[in-house]
Amino acid sequence: APRGTQAEESPFVGNPGNITGARGLTGTLRCQLQVQGEPPEVHWLRDGQILELADSTQTQVPLGEDEQDDWIVVSQLRITSLQLSDTGQYQCLVFLGHQTFVSQPGYVGLEGLPYFLEEPEDRTVAANTPFNLSCQAQGPPEPVDLLWLQDAVPLATAPGHGPQRSLHVPGLNKTSSFSCEAHNAKGVTTSRTATITVLPQQPRNLHLVSRQPTELEVAWTPGLSGIYPLTHCTLQAVLSDDGMGIQAGEPDPPEEPLTSQASVPPHQLRLGSLHPHTPYHIRVACTSSQGPSSWTHWLPVETPEGVPLGPPENISATRNGSQAFVHWQEPRAPLQGTLLGYRLAYQGQDTPEVLMDIGLRQEVTLELQGDGSVSNLTVCVAAYTAAGDGPWSLPVPLEAWRPGEAQPVHQLVKEPSTPAFSWPWW
């Protein structure tokens, strides 16, 4: 750092004063010197270091008419909004010829009410769940003693006796306010007041009670909600995707969930209008007057298979001599599961019904024994899934095929490996 030389008398006739104040104060330090000849530039030092970006103004007043006469030079350093970084020893410095002169020092100090570096923040917490709040204040002057308050009531018997920077709250059962007082020799500063909103705890043990092809009954255990009764619970169901998304841990499903509200108690809900034999993910959150709990994790569930809701369509049954040709199309109504096959039943007047499992084929050729004279022969077809048979079609009479009519293509297809069915009473 530059040092003054004592070979010549110091040109300074006025030295910087002292400033002590609170944060944000604006003040000015002033230096005055008298020199002969061209006035020098006045530099400012803080703690021995030149201030490169000082907010200083320099005024020069000639004492004579000649340039070589004496000049009065005044330099003023403005400190705006005093901060801790502004504190220290201030001096003026000038270079005159080959010599350096430094003024007597002035001091800038910061002293005021405590200043908060950190204040408690608003937040939501689940009922009876521990959490921490932070508060940090500084002087000068130090020390700064903190006193936490909950709902305006001190949490310790005196400042500095309780928790200081971090307050650990073991749990709340009602929405509360927290603030922090900072005490030092100059006075007291109070932090902002943080509102801690108590929400219900996340529900637990979400599980299936019963399953139907298009509806699921689910139940859960509510979490604690403090002094605030639960008003309702909300259940969301979403179609499970292809293994990404929910299963990969994403918080929200890609498509819009199906949302249902349940009055509570009971903590149970029947979810309807679902697709049969379909994987879903479900979750639940419960709400009090203070707001909703967090959602449970997504629970994978699946609706069971149902039976087909309608019979096979467009059943056609014709007879040509000792052969009967029957064909049909898949039911238009929802299958409610994986189609496993078809059952066919035929019956003549005053004869027992014969039941056949056709498998997944949609046509069958029956070999009729005898002269096929049984009258009023009718055929019914039903589709089935693992859950059981769907509704049977209305009986279709077996019509004789008349030459000249186009024979359907499917009637040319025989069953080579299937043994012919016979009517034992023919």
Epitope: P143, D145, A156, T157, A158, P159, G160, H161, G162, Q164, H183, N184, A185, K186, G187, V188
Partner: antibody, heavy 113, light 107 residues
Framework: QVQLQESGPGLVKPSETLSLTCTVS????????WGWIRQPPGKGLEWIGY???????SYNPSLKSRVSISRDTSKNQFSLKLSSVTAADTAVYYC???????WGQGTLVTVSS | DIQMTQSPSSLSASVGDRVTITCRAS??????LRWFQQKPGKAPKLLIS???NLAAGVPSRFSGSGSGSDFTLTISSLQPEDFATYYC?????????FGQGTKVEIK
């Protein structure tokens, strides 16, 4: 520099009221809490009570019916009054900030006729 | 009231010794405990606050430990200026109560 100084009579007659004042310099009594502690000769320390920066008070229940702590913010002083004193109240009385960073040097009050 | 029991009531030790003083509260006081040193004719001096926090300007040979109802003040290497009486104070509840003191004397 923070300093606390107790002042008041060193001798009080039985049944009279003991009055002490603590003058604080370098620290505003409108911040923090300010207390009185006493120590009978050759014995341990006993907490008497305190006054808060806002002027509310807390007293040791064993003395509560006889004790009063007040303040004068314009003089940056707080005071102790203990009524109906007996020889058992003979002690060195200390004033202190309740964080106990700063204490007065103590003043001996003797209760005797 | 919360009772504070200090032990021992006095002890003799030599310079360089490790000295331990204990303080037991009659109920849980968390860490609302302070330790003081008092020399004859002087006001007590704060050593430890919050059961474990060394006060400004106190040598690091002093340390505090404990929480709940059992607390310890340890002087790791006793120095000549440490011969004094030591007190604990609970400030968890009003009335604040001091231990009866432990006098550390020269052996």
């Amino acid at each position: 520099q923070v300093q606390l100084q107790e002042s008041g009579p060193g001798l009080v007659k039985p049944s009279e009221t003991l009055s002490l004042t603590c003058t604080v310099s370098g620290y505003s009594i409108t911040s923090n809490y300010w207390g009185w502690i006493r120590q009978p000769p050759g014995k341990g320390l006993e907490w008497i009570g305190y006054i808060t920066y806002s002027g509310s008070t807390s007293y040791n229940p064993s003395l509560k019916s006889r004790v009063s702590i007040s303040r004068d913010t314009s003089k940056n002083q707080f005071s102790l009054k203990l009524s109906s004193v007996t020889a058992a109240d003979t002690a060195v009385y200390y004033c202190a900030i309740t964080t106990f960073y700063y204490w007065g040097q103590g003043t001996l009050v003797t209760v005797s006729s | 009231d919360i009772q504070m029991t200090q032990s021992p009531s006095s002890l003799s030790a030599s310079v360089g010794d490790r000295v331990t003083i204990t303080c037991r509260a009659s109920q849980d006081i968390g860490n609302y405990l302070r330790w003081f040193q008092q020399k004859p004719g002087k006001a007590p001096k704060l050593l430890i606050s919050g059961a474990t926090n060394l006060a400004a300007g106190v040598p690091s040979r002093f340390s505090g430990s404990g929480s709940g109802s059992d607390f310890t003040l340890t002087i790791s290497s006793l120095q000549p200026e440490d011969f004094a009486t030591y007190y604990c104070l609970q400030s968890k509840e009003s009335p604040w109560t001091f231990g009866q003191g432990t006098k550390v004397e020269i052996k």
